[in-house]
Amino acid sequence: EAHKSEIAHRYNDLGEQHFKGLVLIAFSQYLQKCSYDEHAKLVQEVTDFAKTCVADESAANCDKSLHTLFGDKLCAIPNLRENYGELADCCTKQEPERNECFLQHKDDNPSLPPFERPEAEAMCTSFKENPTTFMGHYLHEVARRHPYFYAPELLYYAEQYNEILTQCCAEADKESCLTPKLDGVKEKALVSSVRQRMKCSSMQKFGERAFKAWAVARLSQTFPNADFAEITKLATDLTKVNKECCHGDLLECADDRAELAKYMCENQATISSKLQTCCDKPLLKKAHCLSEVEHDTMPADLPAIAADFVEDQEVCKNYAEAKDVFLGTFLYEYSRRHPDYSVSLLLRLAKKYEATLEKCCAEANPPACYGTVLAEFQPLVEEPKNLVKTNCDLYEKLGEYGFQNAILVRYTQKAPQVSTPTLVEAARNLGRVGTKCCTLPEDQRLPCVEDYLSAILNRVCLLHEKTPVSEHVTKCCSGSLVERRPCFSALTVDETYVPKEFKAETFTFHSDICTLPEKEKQIKKQTALAELVKHKPKATAEQLKTVMDDFAQFLDTCCKAADKDTCFSTEGPNLVTRCKDALA
């Protein structure tokens, strides 16, 4: 229903705390370089204005759209052009073009320093002094680094953060209480970020139809007892929520997500038997819980899919007269039978089915032509199953760090032109799939592995889009989202690449590496490994292992030496020589 004042409506629906949090996230995601204090000032002004509109919806400017109100605020920031360059040109446009312009200037890889966690004591002091400001800083820092983070989920993670600090800051050993808990939240939030970015990419590149297909598959797997109309309703609502968040309409997004959670909890009987635990929780926890609720038990008496989609005489009539609905029904039926498949695989199968009907329904005897379609799915199913088996076996053999290194070598060979930091980041993220998925029960591995890899590869594509350097990567990133992972997996050594010259300084290290945290040490070593592969793309695994073992031994020796600096300056050049010889 239409409201006289959109901002008053959203303020009333969301409440002051969530309203302020969402406005802060929105501003931080649009203007990623501004300080917390600058954004906090704007948020307060917007909130005060919203309150005047709640008091009197007819007050001046209260009838303006949220894009107009927020855009006007952002465009009034002093020194916009000096700080943001051409983004300032957006302010010469009218809505809705102005908002589109802001969206196009969101930076997936902003040049901001990594978000460093303060010492436990310092954190607890500032949290106790002003919890609201402390959480505001958290929202701001995460949102500006992740401009497509799913805003209502970010509020959930902030709430988790708050609860952890409240609990741990009361303990004697704050550090050992905080570190594992905050690491856990950070890991989950980073995964949430890449998953959401993938959803926004799907929406931006292929439109609502593509996202809705993703949602139908995912929801059908989770709620196999819900009928198609129920799944369609949920998919339509979920598409709207994600479209709003991806489009920067964060207040509408959070409000609609709360509505969707309410609807699901009021209609558990027709959706799933597994929702009650989630529905007993408060709003943010409830919506989060519903988004990752376990799959309902599959109905025992599901008929063979062939009856509806191969054996029926009306297949071509349904395809011709109601294409999207028919394919949607197919996707629903196939997905509810296969919680053990990835959504990407299910979408590939639906695409294969569509292509088969497109071809067969134009022939003289369609049933004879499409009669074998389900058998033709077999190779499409086997490929990711083999990928999971091979990679999980390798992970179990090498552990996470070794597995990351194997992936780093593989991907540097596939796309050696890509910058080393991007390759290292990608390999580290791709390598985490082992820890995340390979320990799961057999029937959960494939969906976990493939859908996670797809999300990470989407980030590779986004970073590569900014500065395209590899034809291999461009080729895989240009196709459909669901074909990306198989495309990357199928890439081999790039034969067009001219190996990089060997530069001694690339492999020269200093004693400061000894004091780095383990993660940073690993990144340094992985950077060297990528550079080695760029120098010798066809080096064997054995040669690379020899060099890396030597390198690890060198670090271990020098970091234990009494005079570290001397050790690094004398042993370093020897290491470089041995590396060159080993790779010759």
């Epitope: 009928d227 198609f228 109309a229 129920e230 799944i231 369609t232 309703k233 027709t270 008929p303 009856a307 509806d308 989609f309 054996e311 029926d312 005489q313 009306e314 297949v315 009539k317 349904n318 007269e321 109601a322 609905v325 028919f326 029904t329």
Partner: nanobody, 126 residues
Framework: EVQLLESGGGLVQPGGSLRLSCAAS????????VAWFRQAPGKEREFVAG????????YYADSVKGRFTISRDNSKNTLYLQMNSLRPEDTAVYYC???????????????????WGQGTLVTVSS
């Protein structure tokens, strides 16, 4: 829960007409395809006609094409089967059936339809 209730059956002379109705209760009935089946004494249930839900698409068995017309009135949650040029071989109990939330008739196999009305008898005889 889906509930279906047929009415409109009766005795009619060959060449005559009848209109069957099926009143449906289900939240998504307007998005659900509904089918008419019939069962003559001693025979299997057979598909007669169907209509899409939220999709303008109709389906007919070859034996009734051109004689029977299926339609729906979503404002009344009611499905109709207009039967013209009736023949003695059309004598049967007529049932309406639904697969909840399915907008298309993707199969004419009676076993795949979980919800049925109690049926209405149509007798074509002189």
């Amino acid at each position: 829960e889906v509930q279906l209730l047929e009415s409109g059956g009766g005795l009619v002379q060959p060449g005559g007409s009848l209109r069957l109705s099926c009143a449906a209760s289900y939240r998504y009935i307007d998005e659900t395809a509904v089918a008419w089946f019939r069962q003559a004494p001693g025979k299997e249930r057979e598909f007669v006609a169907g209509i899409g839900g939220g999709v303008d698409i109709t389906y007919y068995a070859d034996s009734v094409k051109g004689r029977f017309t299926i339609s729906r009135d979503n404002s009344k949650n009611t499905l109709y089967l207009q039967m013209n040029s009736l023949r003695p071989e059309d004598t049967a109990v007529y049932y309406c059936a639904a697969r909840p939330g399915r907008p298309l008739i993707t199969s004419k196999v009676a076993d795949l339809y979980p919800y049925w009305g109690q049926g209405t008898l149509v007798t074509v005889s002189s």
